[in-house]
Interface confidence: medium
Amino acid sequence: QRFAQAQQQLPLESLGWDVAELQLNHTGPQQDPRLYWQGGPALGRSFLHGPELDKGQLRIHRDGIYMVHIQVTLAICSSTTASRHHPTTLAVGICSPASRSISLLRLSFHQGCTIASQRLTPLARGDTLCTNLTGTLLPSRNTDETFFGVQWVRP
Amino acid sequence: QRFAQAQQQLPLESLGWDVAELQLNHTGPQQDPRLYWQGGPALGRSFLHGPELDKGQLRIHRDGIYMVHIQVTLAICSSTTASRHHPTTLAVGICSPASRSISLLRLSFHQGCTIASQRLTPLARGDTLCTNLTGTLLPSRNTDETFFGVQWVRP
Amino acid sequence: QRFAQAQQQLPLESLGWDVAELQLNHTGPQQDPRLYWQGGPALGRSFLHGPELDKGQLRIHRDGIYMVHIQVTLAICSSTTASRHHPTTLAVGICSPASRSISLLRLSFHQGCTIASQRLTPLARGDTLCTNLTGTLLPSRNTDETFFGVQWVRP
């Protein structure tokens, strides 16, 4: 009987539950378009359950299909600013290992000051996700305006 | 044997399954920027499985990490209207209990007439989510243009 | 004992796991506003686990509540182009069976070149989802700019 009880927890365990929601820490030095993220209860409402941060970039710990989502708001921005500084583009991709490097999600700001999107994508243990913001405008660090997260969906 | 069968349903039960998708009912009176929501099969494709509505605002019934998503389209709107009536901003946040009051998600319309975004966030039983639309433009009540929902993701 | 073990897998099975992420194959002939999708590992990062493609349209195989998401980027586009060719609108809906025909999600491009959104909606086995792009502008076929997917969330 005990065996059946222990066994029957396996489905829950196999669900993975891996999930992370990150807030912006800082932008990179010149020539480095990457956004650097941070997460953890001490910082507010950001968290990492499974994935880890590696020098501000998100590293996956469990193979599976993930829902990846992001919102980035430009800090000192109006529709005039946004169009004047066009093109400002955000791309989310696998940046490591190099053999799996690929762009997963790409958006341009055009005359807007916020982009937001999401997609399903297969990710493997060890994949590191990078978010590149190209252009001269800086992102807002407000935690309700700029965030990035992943949610494990299925094996 | 019956005990093992009953027990083994726990993982499914513990998944929570709490989910809601709401459609716009009406806007608030002057000085009240909140959007008031409604949901239920009789209204179309909106529903509440777990969360409840409290005076048009969504109240959470189960602790956990949720995916919160929203789309709001302005009713009589062109890019000219949107920019002329700027700033029009939508914010989603915990409005009650006041001790947990925080903005979760914020977007401005700039020259667009629709905003859409989503994020992962921890919510607790009793948290009430409010969606505040500031500005002079009114939202569309079309159910495919304006909607708001949450999905329980993990404990 | 074996019976208890077999039984306890049911919750996992009943989760459904149905999920699909599609990339744009082509647009329809004149007078057909539908986008035609494709998916599968041979094509890159698109996939179908449960749902199927029927002449480029997504057909659901399991009843339940689904998270539907989409991003469409216009191919040769600037904010000037987008506003000049306005209205360009994307709508996602159930197009078959005709008795269940309904629009689920609708967005206009206004002065932007990308739309992205998501929503929760009940879908039934046999429902076919169509994505209609109205206007004269063409969508980008880049897999990180235009994609469409569904994820089964609960019964």
């Epitope: 660090r141 305006e145 | 901003t89 006041a98 500005g135 | -």
Partner: antibody
Framework: QVQLQESGPGLVKPSETLSLTCTVS??????????WSWIRQPPGKGLEWLGY???????NYNPSLKSRVTISVDTSKNQFSLKLRSVTTADTAVYYC??????????????WGQGTLVTVSS | EIVLTQSPATLSLSPGERATLSCRAS??????LAWYQQKPGQAPRLLIF???NRATGIPARFSGSGSGTDFTLTISSLEPEDFAVYYC?????????FGGGTKVEIK
């Protein structure tokens, strides 16, 4: 017309507790919409928000003072109160009570009391 | 916390002139900015909320504009009773913060 009136001692000794009460008339502290707040202004300086209370008893405090401040509400008397512990001369200020109108993002203050000067001195 | 910087610290103008007061936020506050007027010995009075909305009973000569990090309070034609100190306040992030104030004095 909503009116707010602060009351309490004008002189408090260092290390003691400053206690003020705000009485609301022409409106109810039990209103769904409003956040009842305390703001202070040291002589010749700017304004500093101390915290608010909602009718349910939920509070939100300025982190710079969180360890020393308590705001409470008495709906039966239509009053709310401020307690600031372990005061120093830096806490000398005009203390205002105000009604906050807003939401989870924050509030702005549409009705104010006339203010009461509290001096911290031995 | 969000720091609000008001400029100029003092504005010397004559009645009938146009006054333009600036408030800059250290990070975006969207449209969640208010303006107050304070006269000596009085409590502040709410003039503008959410960047551009006039509070009840405020004359039309007061107007607010801006979003994100840069905001402006404009008094189109100064009346004698408008000479006072003006504060901006953000309600975008906790804690709520006020600017240091701009004093509008008679030239």
């Amino acid at each position: 017309q909503v009116q707010l009136q602060e009351s309490g001692p004008g002189l408090v000794k260092p290390s003691e507790t400053l206690s003020l009460t705000c009485t609301v008339s022409g409106g109810s502290v039990s209103s769904d919409y409003y956040y009842w707040s305390w703001i202070r202004q040291p002589p010749g300086k700017g304004l500093e928000w101390l915290g608010y209370i909602y009718y349910s008893g939920s509070t939100n405090y300025n982190p710079s003072l969180k360890s020393r401040v308590t705001i409470s509400v008495d709906t039966s008397k239509n009053q709310f109160s401020l307690k600031l512990r372990s005061v120093t001369t830096a806490d000398t200020a005009v203390y205002y009570c105000a009604r906050g109108d807003g939401d989870f993002l924050g509030v702005c203050f549409d009705y104010w009391g006339q203010g009461t000067l509290v001096t911290v001195s031995s | 916390e969000i720091v609000l910087t008001q400029s100029p610290a003092t504005l010397s103008l004559s009645p009938g002139e146009r006054a333009t007061l600036s408030c800059r936020a250290s990070q975006s506050v969207s449209s969640y900015l208010a303006w107050y007027q304070q006269k000596p010995g009085q409590a502040p009075r709410l003039l503008i909320f959410d960047a551009s909305n006039r509070a009840t009973g405020i004359p039309a000569r007061f107007s607010g504009s801006g979003s994100g990090t840069d905001f402006t309070l404009t008094i189109s034609s100064l009346e004698p009773e408008d000479f006072a100190v003006y504060y901006c306040q953000q309600r975008s992030n906790w804690p709520l913060t006020f600017g240091g104030g701009t004093k509008v004095e008679i030239k």
